[in-house]
């Protein structure tokens, strides 16, 4: 069965690196379910689409999510 | 320095066991998915097998899945690959390989040195 | 499954430029990634994302992917650029990572 459409976690390995939010086109979180048991977080750069799983136990990576809704909410009316 | 080290091949009859080891060190292991990579002699690379870095998804080549096991110990710093019900065209140099962090695109930044198993009667 | 496909080998005079292909349907649409193996040693990542380059691997080689066929170019060939390339795709019909049969560089 590919592993795309296994009901799995996806996320193989972990970044803990600072992302620059500038840098990121998307930031998927997919929340802990019954088929996986962790928080997994998908960032999606702009350069080239390249997707990483970044570890949301990173303070870094915390960091990156309060700058990202902070930006968000500045949008939003 | 960062680098992965093999061991465990050796000379093995038809139907036997092995177990390889791979040894990580200089960079954070427990964050990084982890493979086997094989190349038969002469031959060139085939994908074996990836475990993640918590070690709770494994997957497989088909023609090595019921027979091998992929596993770590993190707290180790360690890889393994339990072959079991060898085959002699499981006879290659088996590498372990580290995991570039790309989501749902694998390949390969580090490799180690490789460890050669031989499965002859 | 995605099969690709490279030349058994390829020569080259030292000083000239190297041009190593992997052939597949639509490549261009996937990331390639090259890598080189010397005589004995393991396999080094040389070229990711079509024409990314790792630190420490020359500005020499280089990498470009459109159409159906992916490309590793080696300029200024070197006696120590003699080896096995492999280009490697993630296949997502069958989710899992795929190389070229491998191409045999030798410097003349």
């Known amino acids: 069965v590919p592993l795309s459409r296994t009901v799995r976690c996806t996320c193989i390995s972990i970044s803990n690196q600072p992302v620059n939010p500038r840098s990121l086109e998307k930031l998927e979180i997919i929340p802990a379910s019954q088929f996986c048991p962790r928080v997994e977080i998908i960032a999606t750069m702009k350069k080239k689409g390249e997707k990483r799983c970044l570890n949301p136990e990173s303070k870094a990576i915390k960091n990156l999510l309060k700058a990202v809704s902070k930006e968000r909410s500045k949008r939003s009316p | 320095q960062v680098q992965l080290v093999e061991s465990g091949g050796g000379v093995v009859q038809p139907g036997r066991s092995l177990r390889l080891s791979c040894a990580a060190s200089?960079?954070?292991?427990?964050?990084?998915?982890m493979h086997w990579v094989r190349q038969a002699p002469g031959k060139g690379l085939e994908w074996v097998a990836v475990?993640?870095?918590?070690?709770?998804?494994?997957y497989y080549v088909d023609s090595v899945k019921g027979r091998f096991t992929i596993s770590r110990d993190n707290s180790k710093n360690t890889l393994y690959l339990q072959m079991n019900s060898l085959r002699s065209e499981d006879t290659a140099v088996y590498y372990c390989?580290?995991?570039?962090?790309?989501?749902?695109?694998?390949?390969?930044?580090?490799w180690g040195r490789g460890t050669l198993v031989t499965v002859s009667s | 499954n995605f099969m690709l496909t490279q030349p058994p080998s390829v020569s080259v005079a030292p000083g000239k430029t190297a041009r190593i292909a992997c052939g597949g349907g639509?490549?261009?649409?996937?990331?390639v990634h090259w890598y080189q193996q010397k005589p004995g040693q393991a396999p080094v990542l040389v070229i990711f994302?079509?024409?990314d380059r790792p630190s420490g691997i020359p500005k020499r080689l280089s990498g470009s992917n459109s159409g159906n066929t992916a490309t590793l170019t080696i300029s200024r060939v070197e006696a120590g650029d003699e080896g096995d390339y492999y280009c490697?795709?993630?296949?997502?019909?069958?989710?899992?990572?795929?190389f070229g049969g491998g191409t045999k560089l030798t410097v003349l």
């Open positions: 390989a580290r995991d570039s962090g790309s989501y749902l695109d694998w390949y390969f930044d580090l």
């Open positions: 994302y079509d024409s």
């Open positions: 639509n490549i261009g649409d996937k990331s």
């Open positions: 475990i993640s870095y918590d070690g709770n998804n494994k």
């Open positions: 200089g960079f954070t292991f427990s964050s990084y998915g």
């Open positions: 490697q795709v993630w296949d997502s019909s069958s989710d899992r990572p795929v």
